[in-house]
Amino acid sequence: NIDVCKLGTVTVQPAPVIPLGSAANISCSLNPKQGCSHYPSSNELILLKFVNDVLVENLHGKKVHDHTGHSSTFQVTNLSLGMTLFVCKLNCSNSQKKPPVPVCGVEISVGVAPEPPQNISCVQEGENGTVACSWNSGKVTYLKTNYTLQLSGPNNLTCQKQCFSDNRQNCNRLDLGINLSPDLAESRFIVRVTAINDLGNSSSLPHTFTFLDIVIPLPPWDIRINFLNASGSRGTLQWEDEGQVVLNQLRYQPLNSTSWNMVNATNAKGKYDLRDLRPFTEYEFQISSKLHLSGGSWSNWSESLRTRTPEEEPVGILDIWYMKQDIDYDRQQISLFWKSLNPSEARGKILHYQVTLQEVTKKTTLQNTTRHTSWTRVIPRTGAWTASVSAANSKGASAPTHINIVDLCGTGLLAPHQVSAKSENMDNILVTWQPPKKADSAVREYIVEWRALQPGSITKFPPHWLRIPPDNMSALISENIKPYICYEIRVHALSESQGGCSSIRGDSKHKAPVSGPHITAITEKKERLFISWTHIPFPEQRGCILHYRIYWKERDSTAQPELCEIQYRRSQNSHPISSLQPRVTYVLWMTAVTAAGESPQGNEREFCPQGKAN
């Protein structure tokens, strides 16, 4: 709040703008008849230094010259870059109570002369764009610095534009508002940037360019594709381009891909035939343009065209599996399962599957279409049956896949040996086996089939399977494998007309079960105790249960309990024990064991056998 210097003046030598590292002398002078009213000799002029409106120093000790009561000169040094405010105040020393009165103030700017601008780069976006140049201004000057961009061209044409940098804005780019037409393709242009501020000036080196050097074509627009005869693999890509474009680059990829197919097209005139597209696939297409075969810059990529190629008839064969269940003495239920074709084989939306069951000798044929990936029929148990399935989309059907219906586990000689299941990691299980020892006929293929061992899984969930060539003896199963779940795994060996299988349980990761089995009843029969239990709920098993343990001890005894270990079988839910004394009260409980350890004990039951013990 300086009152426009009524009391006096402040001047700076050599100037209010000084280079970094320089000193300045600030003189504060009172106007005639101004000052302390009664005692001019008591006038004391003080100089205060402010940075960002904060008082940082009283320069009382920097006084280099003093006309008592009239003027004082102060030397200021070590000023930092930017602006510093100095305020001169009058202190009437006879009046201690009155604060010093502002006389006048001055701002000193400290900065540097501009460096020559460097790295000039000019562009004109499109044939109708304007020339814009950018440059590197070098070190910040901390002063208002004016920049002039000057362009010189053929016929001595020149033009220029100006801007400035200060502490609020930076000037390192200017648009000249000039458009260079293509008929200047051979001409040379020169640009130069000049920087000037209160401490000096500098000029860039001249930067020379041609039309082709700086004109970046606009990206192509209005991109579209026409599929020849609704083909899913061939299409003509079309687009609009600026008139002078001679070279295009096309890139396209399926939407889920990570690598582009690239094509260069010379004199395409907005049209290019593509012949290697995948049917029924979402594609992304982009195009870039260039004005000259050897020189010039590529345009930015166009906006993406996203479209799906048309369908074509399915290729490839379905992977089929089946289950057989006898219903009564003359009927069996056949459940067929198949895996969906992958997109590159389906080549369209699969509308339905054509399923055929045929009795080979009597020529009985059952046919149906379904939209599901399974089909169940009841057929006679007699005769040799074969099944076939094909997939259909809007353009046609795949070749049918045939499979002979045999008794999958009917031939013991075909059963694979030494089947093992090892957990590889959280998501898969490695199954290995040895071939059947005395197979009558050659193994055509192995099928590894697995299903979660949970209630109702046979009826609720289709099986998972892998087809393995006959010379392979291992399979890594991962589809729908979850940790802490026990799977029944079957390895089938199939010949032309027979099948044999071996079964094993396995898990990909295991923990000790959460709880033990629940003893539901203890009954005494013929001097033996039968312990009955309910199995541990499926979510609490946490892997494959290897065996159960039945513990017992005399009530109130502190001795170690006795135990009996039973191999786990799903179908078993009772077991006899016969080493208990009659008319002694026992406490019994059970635990379950996985490969990771033993569960906590289940419920305790007390029982006092009545009969005679062994």
Epitope: L157, T158, C159, Q160, S181
Partner: nanobody, 126 residues
Framework: QVQLQESGGGSVQAGGSLRLSCAAS????????MGWFRQAPGKEREGVAA????????YYADSVKDRFTISQDNAKNTLYLQMNSLTPEDTAMYYC????????????????????WGQGTQVTVS
């Protein structure tokens, strides 16, 4: 809206002088190319002289060098063409053009490059 208004045309004897003016309105005058063009009946429009208002560079057609002078008055937003030693070949409609925003190989002489045009003023030399 930019408007260019020419004045100062008329009839004059061979060897005489005329001074054409072009008043620009609705227009930022600095750092622009402004030019004078002429078109005789049945002929193409040709560049006579041009000036760059940002730096004072001037350009002249060979046929008028040393006879015509182009100048400007920034304060009045006005462009001038002083024509001395006029000949019957100088007879034409004279147009004022402003803002050379598209550079062709003809440079300042190419009328396609200018953004704004006046209605013209007739000069007849007998």
């Amino acid at each position: 809206q930019v408007q260019l208004q020419e004045s100062g045309g008329g009839s004059v004897q061979a060897g005489g002088s005329l001074r054409l003016s072009c008043a620009a309105s609705g227009y930022t005058y600095s750092n622009r190319h402004m030019g004078w063009f002429r078109q005789a009946p049945g002929k193409e429009r040709e560049g006579v002289a041009a000036i760059y208002t940002g730096g004072g560079s001037t350009y002249y057609a060979d046929s008028v060098k040393d006879r015509f002078t182009i100048s400007q008055d920034n304060a009045k937003n006005t462009l001038y063409l002083q024509m001395n030693s006029l000949t019957p070949e100088d007879t034409a409609m004279y147009y004022c053009a402003a803002d050379l925003t598209r550079w062709y190989s003809g440079g300042w002489r190419d009328p396609r490059g200018y953004k704004y045009w006046g209605q013209g003023t007739q000069v007849t030399v007998s």
